[in-house]
C-alpha cells in the first residue's frame, strides 16, 4: 500500500533508502532540456516475489526540443540549494539491505536522468537521514523514518535528527562513519 505523503522534511538534511519495498514507484524524471519519451512509463516499479525483486519499466529521456511541449513562464532555479528528497544515488548498496526478500536495490541511473529522484514509497519502508554538507548531526534518537499504517491512514514516524551548522557531515548507514545500528532503538511515535 502506497504511503499517502512523502517522508518528513528535516532542515539541512536529506534522506535515502537502503532498499525499496515491492510496490515502490520511482518517477521517470529527466534533467533540464529533456523529457520522458512519449511512449514511456510514468515510473519504474519495484516488483517481484519473495525470492526475487526487480524494477519493471525502463525510464527513457529524450530532448525536449523534439516534443510538442511548452516552457512555463515561472521556471524554477536551475539547482535547488537543498534537496529535500532523495538525490540520485550510486547503485551500490549494503548487501544485507538490498538482498532483503521483497526489496529492490537502488536502480542504476538512466541517460539524462534528473539529479533528484522522486519515489512513491509503500507502507513499511524505512528511510535514513543525513545532514547536508557543512552541517553536523545532533541525535536525540533514530535518524530514520518509517511509513506506518495507523487507523487506516498512512504516516511517517518523525526522525530524531537536528542538523547544526558545524563543518562535519553525518553518514548514511553502511558508509564510512556509520551511525549506531537501527535495531533495538526506541522508535519515535506520534499519537493518532
Amino acid at each position: 500500500e502506497l504511503c499517502d505523503d512523502d517522508p518528513p522534511e528535516i532542515p539541512h538534511a536529506t534522506f535515502k533508502a537502503m532498499a525499496y519495498k515491492e510496490g515502490t514507484m520511482l518517477n521517470c524524471e529527466c534533467k533540464r532540456g529533456f523529457r520522458r519519451i512519449k511512449s514511456g512509463s510514468l515510473y519504474m516499479l519495484c516488483t517481484g516475489n519473495s525470492s526475487h525483486s526487480s524494477w519493471d519499466n525502463q525510464c527513457q529521456c529524450t530532448s525536449s526540443a523534439t516534443r510538442n511541449t511548452t516552457k512555463q513562464v515561472t521556471p524554477q532555479p536551475e539547482e535547488q540549494k537543498e534537496r529535500k528528497t532523495t538525490e540520485m544515488q550510486s547503485p551500490m548498496q549494503p548487501v544485507d539491505q538490498a538482498s532483503l526478500p521483497g526489496h529492490c536495490r537502488e536502480p542504476p541511473p538512466w541517460e539524462n536522468e534528473a539529479t533528484e529522484r522522486i519515489y512513491h514509497f509503500v507502507v513499511g519502508q524505512m528511510v535514513y537521514y543525513q545532514c547536508v554538507q557543512g552541517y553536523r548531526a545532533l541525535h536525540r534518537g533514530p535518524a530514520e523514518s518509517v511509513c506506518k499504517m495507523t487507523h487506516g491512514k498512512t504516516r511517517w514516524t518523525q526522525p530524531q535528527l537536528i542538523c547544526t551548522g558545524e563543518m562535519e557531515t553525518s553518514q548514511f548507514p553502511g558508509e564510512e562513519k556509520p551511525q549506531a545500528s537501527p535495531e533495538g532503538r526506541p522508535e519515535s511515535e506520534t499519537s493518532c
Partner: antibody, heavy 114, light 107 residues
Framework: QVQLQQSGAELVRPGTSVKMSCKAA????????IGWVKQRPGHGLEWIGD????????DYNEKFTGKATLTADTSSSTAYMQLSSLTSEDSAIYYC???????WGQGTLVTVSA | DTTVTQSQKFMSTSVGDRVSVTCKAS??????VAWYQQKPGQSPKALIY???YRYSGVPDRFTGSGSGTDFTLTISNVQSEDLAEYFC?????????FGGGTKLEIK
C-alpha cells in the same frame, strides 16, 4: 495530508473563456506532474494534459490543443487551466490530478449556456 | 492512441458476492493500468496502480490483475458501499486514456 483544492463552479457564455485553479498542499508542488481530466455524462473521463511545475513542461492531448492552456504558479503551489472559445461541448466537470493519478481534486463544474 | 474498452456498462451483484470488472486495451500497455472508483456526486478515487497494487486505505477485497491488453478488477465479498462506477485507465503512452466505465448495481 496531500490535498488538491479546486476553484468553484462556473456559469459562462458561449464563445468566452474560463480559468480554473487547483491549489496543492501537503507535498512538494514542484516534484510532481499535475494533470487535468474532463468528465461529461455519457462520455466518461478524458485526459486533457499535464504540466510539470518544477520543469515547466506541458503535454496536451492533441484533442485539447488550442482549447486548453495549462499554467502553474510555483510561489502559490497552484495550477491553472484556461479553456477558450467555449461551447456546450465544454460543459463538464474538470478534475486536477497529481502524484501519478493517486490524488484527485473535488472537481470544477463548468456550465456553458447562453 | 490506445483505446481502452470496458465492454460491460452495467453489472448487477448482491452483497457478499464476487464480481469481476474487465478492461481491454487496444495495444500492449504492460502493467501500466490503474483502476478508479467513482461514487455518485464524488470525484474518482484511485484503487489500484500498476494493474495489481492497492493504494493505501483500499480494502483488500479489491484485487487487480492482468498485463498486456487484458485487465480485471475483482471485488470479493461485495459490500453495499461498493455501489459505484469503476473506470480503468492506461498510462503507458500519451495520450492517457480511460475506459468508458462499468456501473456496479447492488441487487
Amino acid at each position: 495530508q496531500v490535498q488538491l483544492q479546486q476553484s468553484g463552479a462556473e456559469l459562462v457564455r458561449p464563445g468566452t473563456s474560463v480559468k480554473m485553479s487547483c491549489k496543492a498542499a501537503g507535498y512538494t508542488f514542484t516534484n510532481y506532474w499535475i494533470g487535468w481530466v474532463k468528465q461529461r455524462p455519457g462520455h466518461g473521463l478524458e485526459w486533457i494534459g499535464d504540466i510539470h511545475p518544477g520543469g515547466g513542461y506541458i503535454d496536451y492531448n492533441e484533442k485539447f490543443t488550442g482549447k486548453a492552456t495549462l499554467t502553474a504558479d510555483t510561489s502559490s503551489s497552484t495550477a491553472y487551466m484556461q479553456l477558450s472559445s467555449l461551447t456546450s461541448e465544454d460543459s463538464a466537470i474538470y478534475y486536477c490530478v497529481s502524484r501519478n493519478f493517486a490524488k484527485w481534486g473535488q472537481g470544477t463544474l463548468v456550465t456553458v449556456s447562453a | 492512441d490506445t483505446t481502452v474498452t470496458q465492454s460491460q456498462k452495467f453489472m448487477s451483484t448482491s452483497v457478499g458476492d464476487r464480481v469481476s470488472v474487465t478492461c481491454k486495451a487496444s495495444q500492449n500497455v504492460g502493467t501500466n493500468v490503474a483502476w478508479y472508483q467513482q461514487k455518485p456526486g464524488q470525484s474518482p478515487k484511485a484503487l489500484i496502480y500498476s494493474a495489481s497494487y492497492r493504494y493505501s486505505g483500499v480494502p483488500d477485497r479489491f484485487t487487480g490483475s492482468g498485463s498486456g491488453t487484458d485487465f480485471t478488477l475483482t471485488i470479493s465479498n461485495v459490500q453495499s458501499e461498493d455501489l459505484a462506477e469503476y473506470f480503468c485507465q492506461q498510462y503507458n503512452s500519451y495520450p492517457y486514456t480511460f475506459g468508458g466505465g462499468t456501473k456496479l448495481e447492488i441487487k
